[in-house]
Amino acid sequence: APVRSLNCTLRDSQQKSLVMSGPYELKALHLQGQDMEQQVVFSMSFVQGEESNDKIPVALGLKEKNLYLSCVLKDDKPTLQLESVDPKNYPKKKMEKRFVFNKIEINNKLEFESAQFPNWYISTSQAENMPVFLGGTKGGQDITDFTMQFVSS
């Protein structure tokens, strides 16, 4: 059966939008007006994952692109990347663990914890125009809270 997906955009808790920065990287910056059209639209897929009270397993693909956010070890450090996949096979219900994020939602604020690397979160920097990355700290300088906006399919 096909996996269920919804299109959305994400902004960090400082209202920075996410845009492409080269072919395989996202960056976060403040956008206004017509520039908002630059922000990436995600296809959030609701996938299978480990049972947990407050965590919903999702995969985050870029809409109409065969790119998914994934978490891998690079130089022994959990790292966020955009990974190219075969569009004939993705998305699917049973995504490989590197593609799975545990969506944690409290009062419409979302966090995305890596299923592959627990306690590592999709993060942005306080500074403008910096890459979106996988961070190992919550509640520090780096931002791990996002809001989601639906986009018509």
Partner: antibody, heavy 120, light 107 residues
Amino acid sequence: QVQLVQSGAEVKKPGSSVKVSCKASGYTFDRYWIEWVRQAPGQGLEWMGEILPGSGDINYNEKFKGRVTITADKSTSTAYMELSSLRSEDTAVYYCARMYYDYDQGFSLWGQGTLVTVSS
Amino acid sequence: DIQMTQSPSSLSASVGDRVTITCKASQDIDRFLSWFQQKPGKAPKSLIYRVKRLVDGVPSRFSGSGSGTDFTLTISSLQPEDFATYYCVQYDEFPYTFGGGTKVEIK
């Protein structure tokens, strides 16, 4: 409080259409699917379709495709289900229910139901 | 379509009894299973979501368990207000489908 309030009972002629409304209050209408389910007298429950007001996404039960139209008006937090080409076997109680956008909470809240009677 | 086979279709029990209702899906439905209660002439009331999560305000005598294709609703100690019909529903795959219901009657 959090509730779904449906429109009143309807009596319709075969071949006509009916439009049932479901007004949501007490929660963020955009973020929940509105589900439509019917229950014929003495029968089980049958899912008809759903709409996510925030995105406009709609999914229908193939069985009703072409006969059912589901819409939502965000300005009034109201969802609608219209069923056309009515026949006697469409006599049923029609329920709306809500489900969170990520499907986590199941059919978490139900409307009180709307009885639609199809009779010549 | 996924078939949801609920059993028994009816049962008689006394106040204080432990009651178990089962629901079998024709294929794996992951975690997307709910249970709800319906009394005659009333709207359904949600009890359990995601197989085993209790809806806020539902008494702890209700519990859900299972995985994959086999699921159970248990009422640990039946109360007078629990006499009703119980349904399972899968919302893993379109079209969402319901069990046939289990009517819990007073013995």
